[in-house]
């Protein structure tokens, strides 16, 4: 069966610099040549788009210049990195994969990665 299953880790902890990375892997039915990957954030039943990128298989994954996401692709696997995260950005980050070409269009959605972001403690003033 070539039904598209999208896999992503259940939980990721962002670094102290507010960077979180995770892998979004999809079982591609057929041989798609154009794939769109979108990261959605779900919090309090609200879903918002964090970033999106379209890539041709074999080419690099490119997000918009002002995107908080970067990523690389390898086969049916996309390595996603989200930067600039703060504690208020904690939430469920869902990987959506769309096979845009060749037809027919096909959509797969992962179960989401819960990203926990903890703001770093401010450095205490030190007296010398």
């Amino acid at each position: 069966c070539k039904a598209m299953h999208v896999a992503q880790p259940a939980v990721v902890l962002a670094s102290s610099r507010g960077i979180a990375s995770f892998v979004c892997e999809y079982a591609s039915p057929g041989k798609a040549t154009e794939v769109r990957v979108t990261v959605l954030r779900q919090a309090d039943s609200q879903v918002t788009e964090v970033c999106a990128a379209t890539y041709m298989m074999g080419n690099e994954l490119t997000f918009l210049d002002d995107s908080i996401c970067t990523g690389t692709s390898s086969g049916n696997q996309v390595n996603l990195t989200i930067q600039g995260l703060r504690a208020m950005d904690t939430g469920l980050y869902i990987c959506k994969v769309e096979l845009m070409y060749p037809p027919p269009y096909y959509l797969g959605i992962g179960n989401g990665t819960q990203i926990y972001v903890i703001d770093p403690e401010p450095c205490p003033d030190s007296d010398f």
Partner: antibody, heavy 114, light 108 residues
Framework: EVQLVESGGGLVQPGRSLRLSCRGS????????ISWVRQAPGKGLEWLGF??????????DYVASVKGRFTISRDDSKFIAWLQMDSLKTDDTAVYYC?????WGQGTLVTVSS | QPVLTQPPSVSVAPGKTARISCGGN??????VHWYQKKPGQAPVLVIY???DRPSGIPERFSGSNSGNTATLRISRVDAGDEADYYC???????????FGGGTKLTVL
């Protein structure tokens, strides 16, 4: 509701031209290739050609039997695609569908006869 | 270009299971899609990527693909399933879609 609606079919004499239109609504029209498929009376489905999305530079491709006679184009700002048919022959008589393969129009009948 | 071979016709009694085959050389390596075509109506995608059902298509429709044959199964067939059924793959060599010749399903 997703829709593809064809128009422009009718009766035309052999050797003449006809332009079919396909208007899409309620889906990501500009992201998808738009194909034209026809079904002649008593025959199966025959893919004629398509215009790819802007990600592919709106390039076109055609089945050998219509290459040079048929031209497919699109205008994403109007959610519309066209099939320009020139030098029509009697065996071009068919119902013509535009499709993304997920979605299909209702078809428009083209009859080529003198 | 791949050649997809379908039986011209398949007959089945109401309530039984219809099986429509689509043969092609090593078709299991391709993603196979199935369309239902009723007279005077537009084709409808009923199975895509071998075995997935688009929303709105009943669970009675299922698909499989292995070896040199893809199969569309319609269980608990009723008169409303009478139609022509077409398999389709994408030819990666020419970057063009290819349809099978179609199978007329008759409900006895």
């Amino acid at each position: 509701e997703v829709q593809l609606v064809e128009s422009g079919g009718g009766l035309v004499q052999p050797g003449r031209s006809l332009r079919l239109s396909c208007r899409g609504s309620n889906f990501n029209f500009d992201d998808l290739a738009i194909s034209w498929v026809r079904q002649a009376p008593g025959k199966g489905l025959e893919w004629l050609g398509f215009v790819r999305s802007k990600a592919y530079g709106e390039t076109t491709d055609y089945v050998a039997s219509v290459k040079g006679r048929f031209t497919i184009s699109r205008d994403d700002s109007k959610f519309i695609a066209w099939l320009q048919m020139d030098s029509l022959k009697t065996d071009d008589t068919a119902v013509y569908y535009c499709t993304t393969f997920n979605y299909w129009g209702q078809g428009t009948l083209v009859t080529v006869s003198s | 270009q791949p050649v997809l071979t379908q039986p011209p016709s398949v007959s089945v009694a109401p309530g039984k299971t219809a099986r429509i085959s689509c043969g092609g050389n090593n078709i299991a390596s391709e993603a196979v899609h199935w369309y239902q075509k009723k007279p005077g109506q537009a084709p409808v995608l009923v199975i895509y990527y071998d075995s997935d059902r688009p929303s709105g298509i009943p669970e009675r429709f299922s698909g499989s693909n292995s070896g040199n044959t893809a199969t569309l199964r319609i269980s608990r067939v009723d008169a409303g399933d009478e139609a022509d059924y077409y398999c389709q793959v994408w030819d990666r060599t020419t970057d063009q879609p290819v349809f099978g010749g179609g199978t007329k399903l008759t409900v006895l």
